[in-house]
């Protein structure tokens, strides 16, 4: 679970399983920085705004990112 109050890396656990895009409110990709040396992907779910950290190295997660960006490009004019 993300801990927003820290200035270091955010995620406590990471999931290799993709979340259902329909239950997804928001997907944040936080690039590596001086505070955290790795990329972090945080999925915010529609239910209560629950946050889940996803494993950027997971093939399933990479596929999810592709699907979401494809969906976004369809929506944008």
């Amino acid at each position: 679970v993300p801990l927003s109050r820290t200035v270091r890396c955010t995620c406590i656990s990471i999931s290799n399983q993709p979340v259902n895009p329909r239950s997804l409110e928001k997907l944040e990709i936080i690039p590596a920085s001086q505070f955290c040396p790795r990329v972090e992907i945080i999925a915010t779910m529609k239910k209560k705004g629950e946050k889940r950290c996803l494993n950027p190295e997971s093939k399933a997660i990479k596929n999810l990112l592709k699907a979401v960006s494809k969906e976004r490009s369809k929506r944008s004019p």
Epitope: R8, C9, C11, I12, K48
Partner: antibody, heavy 117, light 108 residues
Amino acid sequence: QVQLVESGGGVVQPGRSLRLSCAASGFTFSSYGMHWVRQAPGKGLEWVAVISYDGSNKYYADSVKGRFTISRDNSKNTLYLQMNSLRAEDTAVYYCAKDEFDAFDIWGRGTMVTVSS
Amino acid sequence: SYVLTQPPSVSVAPGTTARITCGGNNIGSRSVHWYQQKPGQAPLLVIYYDSDRPSGIPLRFSGSNSGNTATLTISRVEAGDEADYYCQVWDTSSGHYVFGTGTKVTVL
């Protein structure tokens, strides 16, 4: 199967130190945060500390902050709790538990720590 | 810090329904998890994210959460359900994990 096994408990005098270990098996240890939770005799559950999957983040209950240190070795699938300046009120069964996005889905059987002179 | 309050004990007859409450300020906005602990054993997760059941947990266990109260419901109670039950949340403001005071369920 998924398993957590704690060790390192025992009887120790106040002010002394003890190091607990938790050996994990049956899941991808390096993907999950890990917790220590304790239970004093006849009392309820008290969260002690958490460490993120890669060890970069650590958080502690106010009652142990500055005295206890949580750490992990992902190459050995092992979680640790270094307990310094032990007090009588630290007497408890100490459980390690696997994080499942802010729930504790897998627990070890616990190891007893008794602080007594 | 965030406080979760549970009744110390609940007594219930076999075959009936037990309801265990967990009170907290605006707890309905948070995700609540429930654990069962039998004497001499480690806690067991029985409900997570308010109402989801881990695999292996009977359908008799269910959860709800709104307002200032979360509830664990055990329907058709059996003798084997006799245990201590704890609610738990993650306190976003402190980054700490908080357990309720615990409820001892006695099957009459």
